[in-house]
């Protein structure tokens, strides 16, 4: 990440604490899901690649008034060092694909579990 007038760096690879907490929260959401998550709101699908945390936040931040994912939105902001706001568009979104929040959370959870198993905490 680079930014005019400033300097951004990826920093050292952190311990697994933060990733584990995020995974636990996503597990919690999927297990406690009764009615459709966030009333079946749709969000942009993302490429689960480098920059995924910011892209996931940019997608989920467009869902407002859904207390079930507020903690996840906050946690993702703790992974993403630049400012994210509703309406923002990331090149990491799959432009023509929208999916339900519940599916988005499941896909993200599967990918994060894979990263955790492989020891890729950053």
């Amino acid at each position: 990440l680079t930014c005019l007038g400033g300097f951004a760096s990826p920093g050292p690879v952190p311990p697994s604490t933060a990733l584990r907490e995020l995974i636990e929260e996503l597990v919690n959401i999927t297990q406690n899901q009764k009615a459709p998550l966030c009333n079946g709101s749709m969000v942009w699908s993302i490429n689960l690649t480098a920059g995924m945390y910011c892209a996931a936040l940019e997608s989920l931040i467009n869902v407002s008034g859904c207390s079930a994912i507020e903690k996840t939105q906050r946690m993702l902001s703790g992974f993403c060092p630049h400012k994210v706001s509703a309406g923002q568009f990331s090149s990491l979104h799959v432009r023509d694909t929208k999916i339900e929040v519940a599916q988005f959370v499941k896909d993200l959870l599967l990918h994060l579990k894979k990263l955790f198993r492989e020891g890729q905490f950053n």
Epitope: L1, C3, L4, G5, G6, F7, A8, S9, P10, G11, P12, V13, P14, T17, A18, L19, E21, L22, Y53, I61, E70, K71, Q73, R74, M75, L76, S77, G78, F79, C80, P81, K83, V84, S85, G87, Q88, N122
Partner: antibody, heavy 120, light 112 residues
Framework: QVQLQQSGDDLVLPGASVKLSCKAS????????INWIKQRPGQGLEWIGH????????YFNEMFKGKATLTVDTSSSTAYIQLSSLSSEDSAVYFC?????????????WGQGTSVTVSS | DVLMTQTPLSLPVSLGDQASISCRSS???????????LQWYLQKPGQSPKLLIY???NRFSGVPDRFSGSGSGTDFTLKISRVEAEDLGVYYC?????????FGGGTKLEIK
Amino acid sequence: QVQLQQSGDDLVLPGASVKLSCKASGYTFTSYWINWIKQRPGQGLEWIGHIAPGSGSTYFNEMFKGKATLTVDTSSSTAYIQLSSLSSEDSAVYFCARSDIFLSYAMDYWGQGTSVTVSS
Amino acid sequence: DVLMTQTPLSLPVSLGDQASISCRSSQSIVHSNGNTYLQWYLQKPGQSPKLLIYKVSNRFSGVPDRFSGSGSGTDFTLKISRVEAEDLGVYYCFQGSHVPYTFGGGTKLEIK
């Protein structure tokens, strides 16, 4: 309740380094950015940079590149700033403050500040 | 870097008066995502700064409604409708739209 507890005041020699800490409690540490701000005696405030604790990624004020290093220890919910090659210009109070995405990244809670005095 | 210029430097007021502090940025502080990350902080002697206003006009929880923020683009204002003794201190505007984020030079609110 949310608290950011900073390490005690420090007197250091010119040319030395110092590492200041900011221990967070009362909230999920990895969900909020930590900013560092400098205030020289009788002067205004200067933003040094921030760190996203979940990833360890940082944004810096170019003026402090090479001077300040920001890190976190998520297991102890503590943020650190290391200041190197200290000179009298670095004598200041250093604050840590967290940013909340739901307050448009405003700095809603601040530490009490750590005073660093560089003197021989 | 974005220069934030506050006026006046010192603002002597009588308790109960209205106070107005101006903050001008050297360029637009509208972020690329469309938001204006302009905040106001109050620092009392020997204390850490405290958040008053975020995103130009939103009051932080617990901040009395006598504090209000307004403005857009490059021109911003903090108003205190009826100054109380606890309001005295140094007020700083802050832009978080462009790195490096920058503070204004401060305005000292004091008793006339």
